[in-house]
């Protein structure tokens, strides 16, 4: 296609991770333009012909779709002309991992910037005190990973102790045969300390702390995408 | 404000068809999915397919696969949907209704009025 | 395609009750499921969509929850305009498919 342009504008894209079977953004953002008719977005995917999505004339052109997105994307279009150019991809899946391009054409110029997109599965992890063990344990359950992480345990009065000899771990296949749900036992736990569950794979890393009283047990539990940013 | 204004009740012979239409206005007719629903009388609600009117590209029920034609006319604003070989079992409440979300379909958020097509001999 | 098992069929209530309509999917996951309250006579309405994001407009008593294949819609203190039919959507996949219903009435 013909470019209006002739300068280069900044096009800037994110790496970021998609949760299997739930919304997932593919994050890009130039140069605004004012005039929304004159911008062009084109997403594109590597060993994939034809088009992600494309934006043009102030709305959606899905002429060149590829079937497998169709019904699955969106651009944010009230943001088209702030310069938001992000795809919005409905019920994420295994094969939508690789490497996109996000190509912007305006009036001002035109320019593109590549984005790599991982997908799996994460959640955050549930930790309780397991009431039904012959010594007092502590049970971290999370619902769904993919691929299948490690987990590790910390505590804040045993900096640097190794768990692995107290706790037990075990990977359950949920029923789309594809995520695991992760269950993580850890035994012979002392009272006023602070214990933690940590869930790692290649996509995120998913802590859960727990501190347990006399009187209370007080939660708080993270969940933080991997190598995320631009 | 998304209005879906559906054709008026419709009396057919088993055998015949009938196309039932859906106008639409307060939107963008060309950037959201629109779909047909039905609910045979006391009976509960049967997804029959939907259309991105931008394209024209359609999806269907296995169930109505052959017998239903869901089609668009952008020049009217107005979304389709035909149902042919028509038997008894066909009487039912025909809706439209808009998918949220533009090219993303989405769920269906506004719906028409609804139409009776009534299938009797 | 995905089928949604809903449950119960119907089920008698007074106001102020908490009432709880459960939805199972046939398989897999994914967190596209829709509620939606229908009146006699009138089209169906939206109340919920991707499992709990309450529709604009939509009293706060009404709440979605679920993960897996089980996917639920609460009620928290029934009030006389909420007695009418309930259905669930499975709108994640190619083919959309409608839970078969639940009544909700007065006891």
């Known amino acids: 296609f013909g470019i209006s342009g002739k300068h280069f504008i900044t096009v800037t894209t994110f790496t970021s991770a998609g949760n299997i079977g739930e919304d997932g953004t593919l994050s890009c953002t130039f140069e605004p333009d004012i005039k929304l008719n004159g911008i062009v977005i084109q997403w594109l995917k590597e060993g994939i012909k034809g088009l992600v999505h494309e934006f043009k004339e102030g709305k959606d052109d899905l002429s060149q779709q590829h079937e497998m997105f169709r019904g699955r994307t969106a651009v944010f279009a009230d943001q088209v002309v702030v310069g938001n150019a992000s795809l919005r991809l409905k019920n994420v899946q295994l094969t939508d991992a690789g490497t996109y391009t996000c190509y912007i054409r305006t009036s001002k110029g035109k320019g593109n910037a590549n984005l790599e997109y991982k997908t799996g599965a994460f959640s955050m992890p549930e930790i309780n005190v397991d009431y039904n063990a012959s010594s007092e344990s502590l049970r971290c359950e999370a619902p769904r990973w993919f691929p299948q992480p490690t987990v590790a345990w910390a505590s804040q009065v045993d900096q640097g102790a190794n768990f692995s000899e107290v706790s037990n771990t075990s990977f359950e296949l949920n029923s789309e045969n594809v995520t695991m749900k992760v269950v993580s036992v850890l035994y012979n736990v002392t009272i006023n300390n602070t214990y933690s569950c940590m869930i790692e794979n290649d996509i995120a890393k998913a802590t859960g702390d727990i501190k347990v009283t006399d009187s209370e047990v007080k939660r708080r539990s993270q969940l933080q995408l991997l190598n995320s940013g631009p | 404000e998304v209005q879906l204004v559906q054709s008026g009740a419709e009396v057919k012979k088993p055998g015949a068809s009938v196309k039932v239409s859906c106008k639409a206005s307060g939107y963008t007719f060309t950037s959201y999915w629109i779909g047909w629903v039905r609910q045979a009388p006391g009976q509960g609600l049967e997804w029959i397919g939907d259309i991105y009117p931008g394209g024209g590209y359609t999806n269907y029920n296995e169930k109505f696969k052959g017998r239903a034609t869901i089609t668009r006319d952008t020049s009217t604003s107005t979304a389709y949907l035909e149902l042919s070989s028509l038997r008894s079992e066909d009487t039912a409440v025909y809706y439209c209704a808009r998918l949220d979300g533009s090219s993303y379909r989405g769920a269906m958020d506004s719906w028409g009025q609804g139409t009776l097509v009534t299938v009797s001999s | 395609d995905i089928q949604m098992t809903q449950s119960p069929s119907s089920l008698s209530a007074s106001v102020g009750d908490r009432v709880t309509i459960t939805c199972k999917a046939s398989?897999?996951?994914?967190?596209?499921v829709a509620w939606y309250q229908q009146k006699p006579g009138k089209a169906p309405k939206l109340l919920i969509y991707?499992?709990?994001t309450l529709q604009p407009g939509v009293p706060s008593r009404f709440s979605g929850s679920g993960s897996g294949r089980d996917y639920t819609l609460t009620i928290s203190s029934l009030q006389p305009e909420d007695f009418a039919t309930y259905y669930c959507l499975q709108y994640g996949n190619l083919l959309y498919a409608f839970g078969q219903g639940t009544k909700v009435e007065i006891k």
């Open positions: 991707y499992t709990s």
């Open positions: 398989q897999g996951f994914n967190k596209y």
